[in-house]
């Protein structure tokens, strides 16, 4: 609940906001979670803390890890975790899924593509935009403030859009890129009763005690942009956020729009350090829209580690 995934590319600037908010906040302290070592606030450091923000100027692959932020006030201290992953730059044009921000949809009337996370940075215009790695040219494309406007949107405008900008910190410039998919709304879209693709109903998922486990809830809701559609996990009939087990968190997966036009959503349930008691819980994958709610139940069972000695008996 108080953890947030952030990602970036090596040699680019990455700024991460503490996922906990102060109510109010007086100071924010940042630590390397593994070592509990305090992150400096002096700006001469490549990685430094600045209030609610943690800055990597620039980021290195070795910076990947979990960072702890503690928001302090006279009343309560609140702890959050930033899970940071820094990736090597791709040599080819293909942007992998793990570097993609949430998909946005557009239509003839509304075709704004916002540059993800840009509000965290000290940037100045112009913002550069690329589609499938090609710089956008032509009067149909207008870079306006922190978003791109496409005039007369057509289905061919769907694709991966990358914004590139410069972050300035104390006179030094750092490059930042962010990519998200853009889909064009099919005006002939429709909505169906949710169809859960995974997990199967009453599925038994084998897990190893002490290891991490992921369960994916995936459902489709119709074709085109859906007015209301959601997938979520419940534990013993309780929302994950209310269940109160910090080891078990849900995380939005990729919004999907398959070649057949189906609009689908994923929600990943991450269980850290699986414990015996987790096997007793009922895991419900819920998919709901205006038509109703569908539920698939999963239970966990213990996966017996292979006894290597017995193989040779």
């Amino acid at each position: 609940k108080f953890s947030k995934q952030s990602w970036g590319l090596e040699n680019e600037a990455l700024i991460v906001r503490c996922p906990r908010q102060g109510k109010p906040s007086y100071t924010v302290d940042w630590y390397y979670s593994q070592t509990n070592k305090s992150i400096p606030t002096q700006e001469r450091n490549r990685v430094f803390a600045s209030g609610q923000l943690l800055k990597f100027l620039p980021a290195a692959v070795a910076d990947s890890g979990i960072y702890t932020c503690i928001v302090r006030s006279p009343t309560f201290n609140r702890t959050g975790y930033a899970n940071v992953t820094i990736y090597k730059k791709q040599s080819d044009c293909n942007v992998p899924d793990y570097l993609m921000y949430s998909t946005v949809s557009g239509s003839e009337k509304n075709s704004k593509i916002y540059c993800p996370t840009i509000d965290l940075y000290n940037w100045t215009a112009p913002l550069e935009w690329f589609k499938n790695c090609q710089a956008l040219q032509g009067s149909r494309y207008r870079a306006h403030k922190s978003f791109l406007v496409i005039d007369n949107v057509m289905t061919e405008d769907a694709g991966d859009y990358t914004c590139k900008f410069i972050h300035n910190e104390n006179g030094a410039n750092y490059s930042v890129t962010a990519t998200r998919s853009f889909t064009v709304k099919d005006e002939q879209g429709f909505s169906l009763f949710p169809v859960i693709g995974a997990p199967a109903q009453n599925e038994i998922k084998e897990v190893e005690i002490g290891k991490n486990a992921n369960l994916t809830c995936s459902a489709c809701f119709g074709k085109g942009t859906q007015f209301l559609a959601a997938v979520l996990w419940q534990l013993n009939g309780t929302k994950i956020t209310d269940f109160g087990e910090p080891r078990i968190q849900q995380e939005e997966g990729q919004n999907q729009s398959f070649s057949n036009g189906l609009a689908c959503l994923d929600m990943v349930l991450r269980i850290a350090d699986v414990k015996e008691e987790d096997l007793l819980l009922q895991y419900d994958c819920l998919a709901l829209n205006l038509h109703g709610l569908r539920r698939h139940t999963v239970r966990l069972s213990r996966k017996n580690p292979i006894d290597h000695h017995s193989i040779y008996c």
Partner: antibody, heavy 118, light 112 residues
Framework: QVQLVQSGAKVKKPGATVKISCKAS????????MHWVQQAPGKGLEWMGA????????VYAKKFKGRVTITADKSSSTAYMELSSLRSEDTAVYYC???????????WGQGTLVTVSS | DIQMTQSPSSLSASVGDRVTITCRSS???????????LYWYQQKPGKAPKLLIY???NLASGVPSRFSSSGSGTDFTLTISSLQPEDFATYYC?????????FGQGTKVEIK
């Protein structure tokens, strides 16, 4: 707009317990701490304690510790303040007051008068 | 606990007057983050207090610019540049630097 609506006036006997409610609307309840402040007749303001509705964590002023319990019900966006072992000097108006990300005591309820009399 | 002492406890003034209320804290209200956690509230009879000024000198939303506040770590002043009929009320200073949060005893501004 933000509103904090408190329960009505109460008359209690010495030694009794009073529980006051404070229903919040117009903002996300768990995004704000809820504090309680006492004001005795013709007197000033005295901070009693607070709750973080998101976690249920509480903190109390020494003067009231042991007698005051602050709780919150996320489902109804309502905070409660319970004061036990009432004595005549507890006769006062009690206010709930919410914080923002910038400061405490940003929003106030209308106040609840509690009269302790035998 | 930090003690907040206001003076005067009451004053009489006329509409249009410049009014000054002082508040002293027993400890500096300057936090290591550079913010002074001094607040001013206005309270009218039978009503809840209303935030006027936060963090020494910031006007709360909707508060007229005739209200201003200044001060150092321990000595503070609330000024009403030109008193209006709706300003007759009791004014409290408060500190939110550390627990327990404490208030001044109040200054009642009455019509002369």
């Amino acid at each position: 707009q933000v509103q904090l609506v408190q329960s009505g006036a109460k008359v209690k006997k010495p030694g009794a317990t009073v529980k006051i409610s404070c229903k919040a609307s117009g903002y996300i309840f768990i995004d704000s701490e809820m504090h309680w402040v006492q004001q005795a007749p013709g007197k000033g303001l005295e901070w009693m304690g607070a709750i973080d509705p998101e976690t249920g964590d509480t903190v109390y002023a020494k003067k009231f510790k042991g007698r005051v319990t602050i709780t919150a019900d996320k489902s109804s966006s309502t905070a409660y303040m319970e004061l036990s072992s009432l004595r005549s000097e507890d006769t006062a108006v009690y206010y709930c007051t919410g914080s923002t990300t910038d400061y405490y005591f940003a929003y106030w309820g209308q106040g609840t008068l509690v009269t302790v009399s035998s | 606990d930090i003690q907040m002492t206001q003076s005067p406890s009451s004053l009489s003034a006329s509409v249009g007057d410049r009014v000054t209320i002082t508040c002293r804290s027993s400890k500096s209200l300057l936090h290591s983050n550079g913010i002074i956690y001094l607040y001013w509230y206005q309270q009218k009879p039978g009503k809840a207090p209303k935030l006027l000024i936060y963090q020494l000198s910031n006007l709360a939303s909707g508060v007229p610019s005739r209200f201003s506040s200044s001060g150092s770590g321990t000595d503070f002043t609330l000024t009403i540049s030109s008193l209006q009929p709706e300003d007759f009320a009791t004014y409290y200073c408060a500190q939110n630097l550390e627990l327990p949060f404490t208030f001044g005893q109040g200054t009642k501004v009455e019509i002369k």
